[in-house]
Each structure stands twice: as structure tokens, then as C-alpha cells.
């Protein structure tokens, strides 16, 4: 079965896509849609996907949503939430993307790809 460790080049691609989103943001990202905040300390890929999958009709993050699927071993559907969700806390998609970017950059620098 596949290695549970994402190749560094693949993680770099994901980071670059998040950078593109934050740099190219003009109007409020996804019309200011709100998503569940997540615990970034573990299982970040599936948790991020479970949160972002609930945003529909936002072309700006479609590639990110799709990329995250390659880092999560199971199928994720809208309305599915893991225990990694920060209880009752929602933030704007733009902030979620920024927080995720900071965390993934940290993981990349430290060579932690899981």
C-alpha cells in the first residue's frame, strides 16, 4: 500500500498553490465563506479537507481541495467532521488558508511530511 509519508515535492506543490491563493486574493475569498477551524497538530490533511470540502462554488480553492485528497487516505464527503475540528469555531476561508499555509511551511522546513 502507499507510503503514508507525502513526498516533499508533492507537499511543495500544495504549499505553492496556497501561496497563489493568498497572493492573488482580490475580493473576499469564496465570498467570505466560513469553515470550521481545525487542530493543526495532527492529521492536518484530512482535517483540512473535511473543513474545506463544505465550501462549494468557489473556483479559487477547487485545486486545493483536490490536492488535499492526495494526502488523505480515505474518502471525504461534505458534512463529515473529524475529532480534529475545533469545537464550535468557524473562521473565514481566507484565514483558514493562511493558517494552513503557515503550518505546512513549518512542516516542510522541519522535514515532517506526515
Amino acid at each position: 500500500s502507499p507510503s503514508p509519508v507525502p513526498p516533499s515535492t508533492a507537499l511543495k506543490e500544495l504549499i505553492e498553490e496556497l501561496v497563489n491563493i493568498t497572493q492573488n486574493q482580490k475580493a473576499p475569498l469564496c465570498n467570505g465563506s466560513m469553515v470550521w477551524s481545525i487542530n493543526l497538530t495532527a492529521g492536518v490533511y484530512c482535517a483540512a479537507l473535511e473543513s474545506l470540502i463544505n465550501v462549494s462554488g468557489c473556483s479559487a480553492i477547487e485545486k486545493t481541495q483536490r490536492m488535499l485528497n492526495g494526502f488523505c487516505p480515505h474518502k471525504v464527503s461534505a458534512g463529515q467532521f473529524s475529532s480534529l475540528r475545533v469545537r464550535d469555531t468557524k473562521i473565514e476561508v481566507a484565514q483558514f488558508v493562511k493558517d494552513l499555509l503557515v503550518h505546512l511551511k513549518k512542516l516542510f522546513r522541519e522535514g515532517q511530511f506526515n
Epitope: 500500500s1 502507499p2 507510503s3 503514508p4 509519508v5 507525502p6 513526498p7 516533499s8 515535492t9 508533492a10 511543495k12 506543490e13 500544495l14 483536490r66 490536492m67 485528497n69 492526495g70 494526502f71 488523505c72 487516505p73 474518502k75
Partner: antibody
Framework: EVQLLESGGGLVQPGGSLRLSCAAS????????MSWVRQAPGKGLEWVSA????????YYADSVKGRFTISRDNSKNTLYLQMNSLRAEDTAVYYC????????????????WGQGTTVTVSS | SYELTQPPSVSVSPGQTASITCSGD??????ACWFQQKPGQSPVLVIY???KRPSGIPERFSGSNSGDTATLTISGTQAMDEADYYC?????????FGTGTKVTVLG
């Protein structure tokens, strides 16, 4: 623009060997898994083999296991399929496909297909 | 081994809706993709992740997947939609393609 160009097809006798190549451009080749998919004349699509990105895992259809070997050279942006002990039923158009990103690439979707190269196994 | 079964053919009048089914054991637990292939051409991804459309694919293509069945729906079918369609999923370290459905646009 993402492009995949297959080569190496041709006519070969049963029991013979052939090596297919796929030159990729327009994307970070090493980040993506790649697959070979074939289509026999007048038949449907059949997945043959996959090679994950930098992770290095390989996967094969039961019909080719032990006879075909998939490999890649990330420095040359090239995917290969070494086909040995060829049979008449291996006759098909072989497509090189850009597969998914990450360790669970199969959750992504086969985005880009080459134009295909024809392999004919006949005496 | 895992199998995905599709109807061999579907006929539809221009402007009408064509539905193609893909059946497999607990297919709804997996991601389903759909490919369109026209004669002499390479396949094109039209639906991924059950219901997502890649950029450039018309809105008339939609997909769903639950239980044992994934469905590709073509609304307002056009003559250019006449082609073979294949579903696909991943199971036990292998990709599996459906048997294929030939969509014929009448008239």
C-alpha cells in the same frame, strides 16, 4: 500546458519484449504519480500499472504482473514500461496518463492522457 | 477482483437527459471518476470525486455516487456528447475501469 508523448510501440512476436517511453512536460513530473492504461482494438479501457510520485511505490494489474515493469526517471521527466513475455492479448493502444498528487494519488483523478502508442503482438 | 458494470448502450434525443450507471460493491465508499472517449481520440476526464467537473467540462455533465451505484448525467444532451463513457475507481491497490457505455444521440 501539460503534455505527454508516448513512443516505443510497434510490432513484436509473441514472447518478445518492448519498452515504451513517455516524455512529460508542463508540470512538476516528480510530484505526480503516473499510470499506463491500454485499450485493445474495439475494447474498453484497462489500467496496466502506476508509479507514485517521489514515494516510489509501484502497482500492477494482475494481467501483467511479473511480465511488465514500470519505472521513471524524474531527471528526464520520463515514464517507462518494460514489457516482456508479450502475448497476443497485450495488443493494444497504450496511453501514458498523468495521475494524482501525493501518497494517495488515486484519490485525485487521471487528468491528462497522451495520444497513445500502438503495440501489436503477432507472429 | 473488483468489477464495475455499465450498460452497453444508452440512446438519447438531442436536448434530453442521458443517465449512465456504474455499479460495484460499496462503490459509494470510493471516489468515482468518469471519462469520455470519442472515436480515434484519447479519453478525457469529465467527472472526478464523484461529482466534480474539471475546468473546461460543460455544466451539463454531472455525477453522483452512493450505495453501490455511481451515475453520470448529461443534461441537455448535444450531438457532440456522442461517445463512449467509462467509470473508474480504485480498489485494493488497483484501478478498475467500468465496462463502458456507448451514448448515441438520436436524430
Amino acid at each position: 500546458e501539460v503534455q505527454l508523448l508516448e513512443s516505443g510501440g510497434g510490432l513484436v512476436q509473441p514472447g518478445g519484449s518492448l519498452r515504451l517511453s513517455c516524455a512529460a512536460s508542463g508540470f512538476t513530473f516528480s510530484s505526480y504519480a503516473m499510470s499506463w492504461v491500454r485499450q485493445a482494438p474495439g475494447k474498453g479501457l484497462e489500467w496496466v500499472s502506476a508509479f507514485s510520485g517521489s514515494g516510489g511505490s509501484t502497482y500492477y494489474a494482475d494481467s501483467v504482473k511479473g511480465r511488465f515493469t514500470i519505472s521513471r526517471d524524474n531527471s528526464k521527466n520520463t515514464l517507462y514500461l518494460q514489457m516482456n513475455s508479450l502475448r497476443a492479448e497485450d495488443t493494444a493502444v497504450y496511453y501514458c496518463v498523468q495521475d494524482g498528487l501525493g501518497p494517495y494519488f488515486y484519490n485525485y483523478g487521471m487528468d491528462v492522457w497522451g495520444q497513445g502508442t500502438t503495440v501489436t503482438v503477432s507472429s | 477482483s473488483y468489477e464495475l458494470t455499465q450498460p452497453p448502450s444508452v440512446s438519447v434525443s438531442p436536448g434530453q437527459t442521458a443517465s449512465i450507471t456504474c455499479s460495484g460493491d460499496k462503490l459509494g465508499d470510493k471516489y468515482a471518476c468518469w471519462f469520455q472517449q470519442k472515436p480515434g481520440q484519447s479519453p478525457v476526464l469529465v467527472i472526478y470525486h464523484d461529482s466534480k467537473r474539471p475546468s473546461g467540462i460543460p455544466e451539463r455533465f454531472s455525477g453522483s455516487n452512493s450505495g453501490d451505484t455511481a451515475t453520470l448525467t448529461i443534461s441537455g444532451t448535444q450531438a457532440m456528447d456522442e461517445a463512449d463513457y467509462y467509470c473508474q475507481a480504485w480498489d485494493s491497490s488497483t484501478y478498475v475501469f467500468g465496462t463502458g457505455t456507448k451514448v448515441t444521440v438520436l436524430g
